[in-house]
Interface confidence: low
């Protein structure tokens, strides 16, 4: 695959984990617990999130309360959000570095700055797919303990929300497509052949550039 | 070999007390819940209380509250319960169990403690 | 509290049948998280303390001969014993462990 399309296709990936990350960092369903209330009929459902809290009941009404002081948030809420919105600030200034980097743009001239520029853009999109998963993971292992501590009631036990799947998705997208923009800029930099032919002369040489290792996918 | 042998039962009068103890052996005590399970004379089990790996957090059956204590020592790999204000229906074998995800894996042998007058 | 129904409370067996004992809870035990149904089975013979033979519906306890089969989900769960040997002849308690308070059935007594 040439190292334009290898380019797209990991930019692409890595818009729709981008937009997956958002999703995951504003919906309320990190943690989801459904229990019957004992004093009334209805079942309901209570979803917790970064930023706030809604119960749900078996009649569809849904009311959400935003989480009033930072103070008051634990530990873990206060981490996650900072880690998330880290990750989405982070993939947001690794759009306009793969955007300078990237071979259909003339931002950067052509040559191995280009490449590093598009490197740059690849590596800082894995990082931010690392990042977005250390507040996933660490949820999720709460959560996780919580269900099994014998000492938590069950209306204190939740079980993993759907904003966690979307998150773990979101971030392997972001890995991924981070991997193979750090290919793209590899085989642009070793391969010149490969590359989109462009209208500027200057030199190519291949550089020593990090090679991707398919063991950093998660 | 898991091992769990529960000490300290015995006849008491109604409104005294009793503590219970529970020596664990085979198995890295503080790795797992603990908990008491009883058995009144002919009669099914029923759950006592529960304590967490460091001892931080206990929670206890609805007949017994206010009036037992749960409690471990983890460098004595000990297990113990201590009943206050004792009553005729908690004339039961106090069995001590291992705790892991919120079932009872291995229990003690059971010690009879008998509450009467 | 969620309570623990068990039927019957005694049933008279004979070796080499296979016995279906019945529990049922007033609340589902299944997780849609984990997709699991917590509930554990127990066998306790005349003077010795109750074994682990099955948790989380179906999961066997290792050691535990695989004649015993837990099944089951949400609030109807069955323990069958296939070809029931001598030793088998016990009380047999079912426990929900899916919330404080842990409770058990009441027993199903399996005599001669």
């Known amino acids: 695959m040439g190292s334009a399309a290898l380019e797209i296709l990991g930019l692409v990936l890595c818009l729709v984990g981008w937009g997956g990350l958002i999703l995951a960092c504003g919906l309320p369903m990190w943690q989801v617990t459904a229990f019957l209330d004992h004093n009334i009929v209805t079942a309901q459902t209570t979803w917790k999130g970064l930023w706030m809290s809604c119960v749900v009941q078996s009649t569809g009404h849904m009311q959400c309360k935003v989480y009033d002081s930072v103070l008051a948030l634990s530990t873990e809420v206060q981490a996650a959000r900072a880690l998330t919105v880290g990750a989405v600030l982070l993939a947001f200034v690794a759009l306009f570095v793969t955007l300078a980097g990237a071979q259909c743009t003339t931002c950067v001239a052509p040559g191995p700055a280009k490449a590093r520029v598009a490197l740059t853009g690849g590596v800082l999109y894995l990082l931010c797919g690392l990042l977005a998963l250390v507040p996933l993971c660490w949820f999720a292992n709460i959560v996780v303990r919580e269900f099994y501590d014998p000492s938590v009631p069950v209306s204190q036990k939740y079980e993993l929300g759907a904003a966690l799947y979307i998150g773990w998705a979101a971030t392997a997208l972001l890995m991924v497509g981070g991997g193979l923009l750090c290919c793209g800029a590899w085989v642009c930099t070793s391969r010149p052949d490969l590359s989109f032919p462009v209208k500027y002369s200057a030199p190519r040489r291949p550089t020593a550039t990090g090679d991707y290792d398919k063991k950093n996918y998660v | 070999e898991v091992q769990l042998v529960e000490s300290g039962g015995g006849l008491v009068q109604p409104g005294r007390s009793l503590k219970l103890s529970c020596a664990a052996s085979g198995f890295t005590f503080s790795d797992y819940f603990m908990a008491w399970v009883r058995q009144a004379p002919k009669k099914g089990l029923e759950w006592v209380a529960s304590?967490?790996?460091?001892?931080?957090?206990?929670y206890y059956g609805d007949s017994v509250k206010d009036r037992f204590t749960i409690s471990r020592d983890n460098t004595k790999t000990t297990l113990y319960l201590q009943m206050t204000s004792l009553r005729s229906e908690d004339t039961a074998t106090y069995y001590c169990?291992?705790?892991?995800?919120?079932?009872?894996?291995?229990w003690g042998q059971g010690v009879m403690v008998t509450v009467s007058s | 509290d969620i309570v623990m129904t068990q039927s019957p409370s005694s049933l008279a067996v004979s070796a080499g049948e296979t016995v279906t004992i019945n529990c049922k809870s007033s609340?589902?035990?299944?997780?849609?998280?984990?997709?699991?149904?917590?509930l554990a089975w127990y066998q306790q013979k005349p003077g010795q303390s109750p074994k682990m033979l099955i948790y989380?519906?179906?999961t066997r306890e290792s050691g535990v001969p695989d004649r015993f089969i837990g099944s089951g989900s949400g609030t109807d769960f069955t323990l069958t014993i296939n070809t029931l040997q001598a030793e088998d002849l016990a009380i047999y308690y079912c426990q929900q462990h899916y919330d404080i308070p842990y409770t058990f059935g009441a027993g199903t007594k399996l005599e001669l």
């Open positions: 989380l519906a179906s």
């Open positions: 304590i967490n790996y460091e001892g931080s957090r206990t």
């Open positions: 609340r589902s035990l299944f997780s849609s998280g984990y997709q699991e149904n917590y």
């Open positions: 169990a291992r705790h892991p995800r919120r079932y009872f894996d291995f």
